[in-house]
């Protein structure tokens, strides 16, 4: 039902859902710190613009006794329970920053009259695509899918002279929330990825994956999986791998590959890692000191959510427009705003655009090197290393079908 919003007369409130079930196991205190840091920046920006208003956040905590799994499996009802709590307390802000789990976001969007914007650090699944008042500040599955199709089709790079049309996808059900939805999108028979590929099989057992590595009758040389190097090592160990196998390891929210002292372990030589371009600077603010590189993006998305709200609030106030209108709720898209770590671009559907980076292991230096980057905003690939020191024959990526390797 319609809830009155604390969003007028120079006082603007942000409702932050602090859910026990979360896309990343991040202590809520860290997220609070990120939000508070964001608020400080927003207040400063509004003040500099001559807008004398108050901006605050209300943190809404759910009952941990009922929803205590900690991951996203029981999040569907938690989101709705929190909304009920807000409704009963009549404490809805101008904007809802909250659910990171795809299940809860989908359900909340479905079951509520959303006349206010919802900003999510997560909600990776395809079911959260194209939602008119939802903004997602971490790369959703659709963006990954578009990269993969673009890369599969590419055949005019010095190191990739074949189009690919086949793939195995390893998905065993123990994935993190982001990986679960990324792989789910690749698995879905109606998805863009499936539509564009001629052959795709999902490997669900460790043994299936291990067998493919040396199977002469395999239908594809390419295996997509999601997780970090350690995850791959647990699965692959030091097993021999056929020379034309290419493993694509999706590990978007992990800056560690770019650290100076990182050496790639030997088992990564047949692997291309897909990650996001690192931030312009490693955060050293109060909220980020306790964060691992993997968690950084999650907390940063909360912080950027606050900055996005501040950006929109400033625009609407400067134009003398009302904040509690459908126009405001639908405005959080097709724009670029100044994030904590540089400009942040949102596409026509409110999803964050980013630079994805494909890394390879240099056989010379045993370091991760950038092979190419992909700009999700323009769906374009940019080669960076034109003569990579690959493990693959002739320093070219093999064909995806066995027996038709580089020529």
């Amino acid at each position: 039902s319609q809830v009155s919003q604390n969003c007028h007369n120079g006082s603007y409130e942000i409702s932050v859902l602090m859910m026990g079930n979360s896309a990343f196991a991040e202590p809520l205190k860290n997220l609070e710190d990120a939000v508070n840091e964001g608020l400080e920046i927003v207040r400063g920006r509004l003040q500099n613009a001559g807008l004398n208003v108050t901006v605050n956040a209300t943190f809404m905590y759910s009952d941990g006794l009922i929803h205590n799994s900690g991951d996203c499996r029981s999040s569907t009802c938690e989101g709705l329970d929190l909304l009920r709590k807000i409704s009963n307390a009549q404490r809805m802000g101008c904007v809802l920053i909250g659910p990171s789990c795809t299940y809860s976001t989908f359900q909340m969007y479905l079951d509520t009259e959303l006349s206010y914007p919802m900003i999510s650090a997560g909600s990776f699944g395809l079911s959260c695509d194209y939602k008119e008042t939802l903004t997602r500040l971490m790369s959703p599955a659709r963006k990954l899918m578009y990269f993969l199709v673009n890369f599969w089709k590419t055949n005019d790079l010095p190191f990739k002279t074949y189009s690919w049309s086949t793939s195995y996808v390893y998905k065993n059900g123990t994935e993190t929330e982001d990986c679960f939805w990324y792989l789910n999108a690749l698995e879905a028979s109606v998805s863009y990825f499936s539509h564009e590929l001629g052959f795709k099989v999902v490997l669900r057992q460790d043994k299936e994956f291990q067998d493919i590595l040396m199977d002469h009758n395999r239908k594809s040389n390419v295996i997509i999986m999601c997780g970090g190097p350690e995850f791959l090592y647990k699965l692959k160990g030091d097993r021999a791998v056929a020379e034309d196998i290419v493993i694509i390891l999706v590990d978007l929210f992990n800056d560690q590959y770019f650290e100076d002292n990182v050496t790639a372990p030997d088992y990564m030589k047949n692997v291309l890692v897909l990650t996001l371009s690192p931030g312009n600077s490693l955060l050293n603010s109060s909220f980020s000191r306790n964060l691992s590189p993997t968690k950084r993006d999650f907390a940063l998305a909360y912080l950027n959510g606050i900055l996005l709200f501040g950006h929109m609030l400033k625009i609407f106030l400067e134009n003398g427009e009302n904040i509690t209108t459908p126009k405001f709720a639908h405005a959080f898209r097709n724009l670029t705003f100044e994030g904590y770590d540089g400009p942040v671009t949102l596409d026509d559907w409110g999803d964050v655009d980013s630079t994805m980076v494909l890394l390879y292991t240099s056989v010379d230096t045993k370091k991760y090197k950038v092979l190419l980057t992909y700009d999700t905003h323009v769906n374009k690939t940019y080669p960076v290393d034109m003569s990579p020191t690959f493990t693959w024959k002739n320093s070219k990526l093999p064909n995806d079908i066995t027996g038709r390797g580089p020529q």
Partner: antibody, heavy 117, light 106 residues
């Protein structure tokens, strides 16, 4: 508007090294490629190598591999090109240029390096 | 390495007339080609990238075409400030430049 300002002219002895700097101001530095291009007197342009500061590692043209080192300091938005074992043929104007990967849309003013005994 | 060959080496044209400069790649570079203008004592200036896209602030009289191995830069009506050296550059592989075409006043 992005500007690239290079260090001043250098005169060097054969066998020595030269290090040229290129400071960016007024725009994004880290996520663009910074290339180094040289031009010998009366000659054409020659790409030496490039770096994308946010990624750290540089890539070099084969001709200069082992003799050129390109680095970048994100904190000062400055890129550097060091060329060692100088010989008279290295006498040239050295340009830094910012580009979207390997085409170059913003150029420095150039640094003249003269190698003479 | 990809070798870029420009022709002619020198082109003499009268102001107000059009000029066509050619650039050939030793192997296909798709549409990953840029054109630059350089005046004496100055740094090069980007005119065209992606074979046909004008860079910011470049007048409409400059146009680029071609893909694969054959490329053309056309200047429709030459102004006095257009007389300079023009270079093509491929970036489908490690960048390489053509030898340049000197456009001079006839």
């Amino acid at each position: 508007e992005v500007q690239l300002v290079q260090s001043g002219a250098e005169v060097k002895k054969p066998g020595s090294s030269v290090k040229v700097s290129c400071k960016a101001s007024g725009g994004t530095f880290s996520s663009y490629a910074i290339s180094w291009v040289r031009q010998a007197p009366g000659q054409g342009l020659e790409w030496m190598g490039g770096i994308i500061p946010i990624f750290g590692t540089a890539n070099y043209a084969q001709k200069f591999q082992g003799r050129v080192t390109i680095t970048a300091d994100k904190s000062t938005s400055t890129a550097y090109m060091e060329l060692s074992s100088l010989r008279s043929e290295d006498t040239a104007v050295y340009y830094c240029a910012r580009g979207h990967y390997y085409y170059m849309d913003v150029w420095g003013q150039g640094t003249t390096v003269t190698v003479s005994s | 390495d990809i070798v870029m060959t420009q022709s002619p080496a020198t082109l003499s044209v009268s102001p107000g007339e059009g000029a066509t400069l050619s650039c050939r790649a030793s192997q296909s570079v798709s549409s990953n080609l840029a054109w630059y203008q350089q005046k004496p004592g100055r740094a090069p200036r980007l005119l065209i990238y992606g074979a046909s896209t004008r860079a910011t602030g470049i007048p409409a009289r400059f146009s680029g075409s071609g893909s694969g191995t054959e490329f053309t830069l056309t200047i429709s009506s030459l102004q006095s400030e257009d007389f300079a050296v023009y270079y093509c550059q491929q970036y489908n592989n490690w960048p390489s430049f053509g030898g340049g075409t000197k456009l001079e006043i006839k």
